[in-house]
Each structure stands twice: as structure tokens, then as C-alpha cells.
Amino acid sequence: GSVPPMVNVTRSEASEGNITVTCRASSFYPRNITLTWRQDGVSLSHDTQQWGDVLPDGNGTYQTWVATRICQGEEQRFTCYMEHSGNHSTHPVPSGNSHHHHHHHH
């Protein structure tokens, strides 16, 4: 069967007036996954995002990440979109420097 990913969104200072938002998906199976940033509901172009490889995490499951740089103060317009085994979920950027886990149940 399939194991849905744990999705975790974090933010970090990038440069003056910018922040990097990173979305990590972990502990999922099978390895096929869509992970992308959306702005105002629409997927960002590929050239504005950076992806990590889909790698085994040692438990028979997989992990990956996607990141993008955005203007500080614009965070609420962005959402990490995850799609796995026919299910999707959306994950907003937290306020401040906190990070949060969202478990997507199939």
C-alpha cells in the first residue's frame, strides 16, 4: 500500500527583503510525488524553484524538498502543493520562524 508523506514548511532569511521558503516531504511510499510552490493558487514556473532529489530515508520510504525565494511580507500568497498516490494537500507558510508538520492522510 501507500504511505502518505509528512509535509513540513519552513522559512529562513535569504537576503535583504527576501526569504527562502522550503517545503519538505518525508516518510512516503511509493517514491512518485509532486511537490511544488504555488502563488495565488497557481504553480510557480520551474525556473523559480529548486528541488532536491527523491531519496530513500532508510525506512523503506522516501523524502524530498522544494524551495523558492520570495519577498518578505508576501508569504501568505504562497502555498506548498503536494500530490501523492492520487491525493493532494496544501501547506501554507507559517508566520515568524516557526515550522509545522502537516500529515496528509489517504
Epitope: 504555488r38 497557481v42 501568505q76 500568497r77 500530490e83 493532494h88 496544501t90
Partner: antibody, heavy 117, light 107 residues
């Protein structure tokens, strides 16, 4: 102009199924998630689930997961909500809405589903 | 699930009054909150999103504020067309949940 136009009112018997449609126009249908919400008479609003029309991937409220199916037909820019094993408590107005980032910006006019024996 | 507690459930006010409606979330929703206005037989209309951003075409007498778990919708000077029911909704996590609504009636 963004528009979501829903199908007409339905009357169903307990145990039956209902399928409500939501036809989108005025924007690129496959670019935005479509959400479904219901409102029982005189009550609050309840989120049912969502679909990515571009891929068909869904996200359901656990409360409805066993009885609901959300689909989309990109050739007609139409999303569908099907609810099975209907009971009287399912009597409600069912709405579709477009998900614009992190809120619903446009709503359909609503479809009244009445479940009565 | 995040529970949204809205108050009051109803209120009576006169044209020109200042009206305040509050919404409290059971957890931090990071300002991912929208307010809607609904009139009888109509679908909800978006008023405010991201807790304080006014939707296009919404009069400036409406304003939203708040952060963390506590949020407020204010109508600075109530107009005849504002008599309606108002709902809040959180978008931090699914299932997206709504407040039970506040019905604003004519005094």
C-alpha cells in the same frame, strides 16, 4: 469574469446517491483547485473536499471520505461532487468554490439537495 | 481539527453603529483567516482574507485584524446593505473550518 455555475436542485430518497456539477468559466480551469462546501438549513458551513482539475488528485474531509467522490472533466471545465448513501442530515445547499492561494475567492450559486422519503 | 468559535451568534444594531465580530481558533492559524458575508438565499461573498486584506470591491468601512488565535471583523459604520450573516474560515490546515456565523439584524 470568473463564474462557477452549478446544477439545479435535487430531491433524493435515503440511501440514494446525488451528483452535483460546477461549470467554471472566465479562467484557466486546470490552474486552480476547486473546493466543495455544504450548508445545512439554518446552519453553518462545512468543508467537504477539493480537487486539482489538472491532475484529478483529491483531498477529502475525513468525515465524508467513505461517501464522497470529487471528479473533474477538463474538456468541459466542470467539477463534480457525488455523495452516496444519502441520509436526511445530508439535506443542505452544496457549493463549489475556487481556491485562490489560501482563500476561496469565487463561489457557485449553490445547489439544494433534499433527502426525504 | 481546528475549531472556530465565533461571537456573538447574533446582534442587533442600527445604521451608523460600529459593529465588531470576533473569531477564536483552537490553535494558531497564522493569520490564514477569511471573512465572508452571506445574505438569505445567496452564496457567501468574500470580504477579507489573510486576516486583514480587503477583497476587491469591498467598502473600506469593513476591516479585519488579529493574529495567532484571535481575529476580529469590524464594520465602522453599519449601512442598510450590511444586515446579513458573517462567517470566518481558517485556511491553516484541512479540514478548513468555519465559525458558526453571526447574524447582524436591524435594531
Amino acid at each position: 469574469e470568473v463564474q462557477l455555475v452549478q446544477s439545479g436542485a435535487e430531491v433524493k430518497k435515503p440511501g440514494a446517491s446525488v451528483k452535483v456539477s460546477c461549470k467554471a468559466s472566465g479562467y484557466a480551469f486546470t490552474n486552480y483547485l476547486i473546493e466543495w462546501v455544504r450548508q445545512a438549513p439554518g446552519q453553518g458551513l462545512e468543508w467537504i473536499g477539493a480537487i486539482n482539475p489538472g491532475s484529478g488528485a483529491t483531498n477529502y474531509n475525513e468525515k465524508f471520505k467513505d461517501r464522497v467522490t470529487i471528479t473533474a472533466d477538463t474538456s468541459t471545465s466542470t467539477a463534480y461532487l457525488e455523495l452516496s448513501s444519502l441520509r436526511s442530515e445530508d439535506t443542505a445547499v452544496y457549493y463549489c468554490a475556487r481556491f485562490l492561494g489560501n482563500y476561496f475567492d469565487n463561489w457557485g450559486q449553490g445547489t439544494l439537495v433534499t433527502v426525504s422519503s | 481539527d481546528i475549531q472556530m468559535t465565533q461571537s456573538p451568534s447574533s446582534l442587533s444594531a442600527s445604521v451608523g453603529d460600529r459593529v465588531t465580530i470576533t473569531c477564536r481558533a483552537s490553535g494558531n492559524i497564522h493569520s490564514y483567516l477569511a471573512w465572508y458575508q452571506q445574505k438569505p438565499g445567496k452564496s457567501p461573498k468574500l470580504l477579507v482574507y489573510y486576516a486583514e486584506t480587503l477583497a476587491d470591491g469591498v467598502p473600506s468601512r469593513f476591516s479585519g485584524s488579529g493574529s495567532g488565535t484571535d481575529y476580529t471583523l469590524t464594520i465602522s459604520s453599519l449601512q442598510p446593505e450590511d444586515f446579513a450573516t458573517y462567517f470566518c474560515q481558517q485556511f491553516w490546515t484541512t479540514p478548513y473550518t468555519f465559525g458558526q456565523g453571526t447574524k447582524v439584524e436591524i435594531k
